[in-house]
Interface confidence: low
């Protein structure tokens, strides 16, 4: 039974050329984390690998960088990063959790960033 | 060459503030996480805060409410506001580079800066 | 603050293989990398290993890291004195949000 549940940071929004934290937590739940996968729509950002450790997309290398933590980086960026970002943790024996963020990404210079993760 | 030097440092009584510094020159500043790690006398190292690139501050649950991380991109300096000092706060304080990959570690360190938390 | 887990205190001859231990937990060096540093007496620490087991330019090749688990190793071949120092392991901690270290391992050189 997947008792776990995944905490983002939710929406969020940045500056057309800084940078963000995208971050997801797995709480509630005992299971291992093998692997998490980083994807916007449906393309794969990055992953990271509890044994391998970090692998970022070759299309993406030069404007994302792996962490905080199990976290990713956003950086130099653009208007069309704005869109929806997915953390998949694979788990053993749970099974795979999905978390959600929306990031927008504003012209203006007066973008407010999101609320900061805090882990309680 | 990757040079950081932290100031500020001194004797102060409980319940008082300090504010650190960290000069840094040699590489790109503001491109880098940093943070602050302090080892008390004859103690092993306790990292006190981090600040990333993107602003995001990350503390030690012993010092979360009492101390503030901030940088200077324009000075390429880092400072640690320390407020509501204790005995248990007395350490040599480090100001310490992260990789450029964040979790590979800190790997340019100061000399370290002594704050002394005494009445 | 939960750490990791290090033995206080590690010896050998010169010319010896010694080893030193970093356990932590599934939050920390399961899914992170370690780092270890050696800290001289009377100096700041120095990177020795990052990413589990590479050495930055300049550490002897002596020097080298594993990680299993949740267990990490710092092993020292060819003991020279020179290497009586402080050693601490380091890590991300998921849970935490933070850096957490280990309480550092002294090693003598009999």
């Known amino acids: 039974m997947m008792t776990g549940t995944i905490e983002t940071t939710g929406n969020i929004s940045a500056e057309k050329g800084g940078s963000i934290i995208l971050q997801c937590h797995l709480s509630s739940t005992t299971a291992q984390v093998t692997q998490v996968n980083w994807e916007q729509q449906d393309q794969l950002l990055a992953i990271c690998n509890a044994d391998l450790g970090w692998h970022i997309s070759p299309s993406f290398k030069d404007r994302v960088a792996p962490g905080p933590g199990l976290g990713l980086t956003l950086q130099s960026l653009t208007v069309n990063d704005t869109g929806e970002y997915f953390c998949i943790y694979h788990t053993y024996p749970d099974g795979t959790y999905t978390g959600r963020i929306f990031l927008e990404v504003l012209e203006s210079s007066v973008a407010e960033h999101g609320a900061r993760f805090q882990i309680p | 060459e990757v040079q950081l030097l932290e100031s500020g440092g001194g004797l102060v009584q409980p319940g008082g503030s300090l504010r650190l510094s960290c000069a840094t020159s040699g590489f790109t500043f503001s491109s880098y996480w940093m943070s602050w790690v302090r080892q008390a006398p004859g103690k092993g190292l306790e990292w006190v805060s981090g600040i990333h690139i993107s602003d995001s501050t990350y503390y030690a649950d012993s010092v979360k409410g009492r101390f503030t991380i901030s940088r200077d991109n324009s000075k390429n300096t880092l400072y640690l506001q320390m407020n509501s000092l204790r005995a248990e706060d007395t350490a040599v304080y480090y100001c310490a580079k992260g990789h450029t990959v964040l979790q590979y570690g800190m790997d340019v360190w100061g000399q370290g800066t002594t704050v002394t938390v005494s009445s | 603050q939960s750490g990791l887990t290090q033995p206080p205190s590690a010896s050998g001859t010169p010319g010896q293989r010694v080893t030193i231990s970093c356990s932590g937990d599934i939050s920390n060096t399961r899914n992170n990398y370690v780092s270890w540093y050696q800290q001289l007496p009377g100096t700041a620490p120095k990177l020795l290993i990052y990413?589990?087991?590479q050495r930055p330019s300049g550490v002897p090749d002596r020097f080298s890291g594993s990680k299993s688990a949740t267990s990490a190793s710092l092993a020292i071949s060819g003991l020279q004195s020179e290497d009586e120092a402080d050693y601490h392991c380091?890590?991300?901690?998921?849970?935490?949000?933070?850096?957490?270290f280990g309480g550092g391992t002294k090693l003598t050189v009999l």
């Open positions: 380091g890590t991300w901690d998921n849970t935490l949000n933070a850096w957490v």
């Open positions: 990413g589990n087991h």
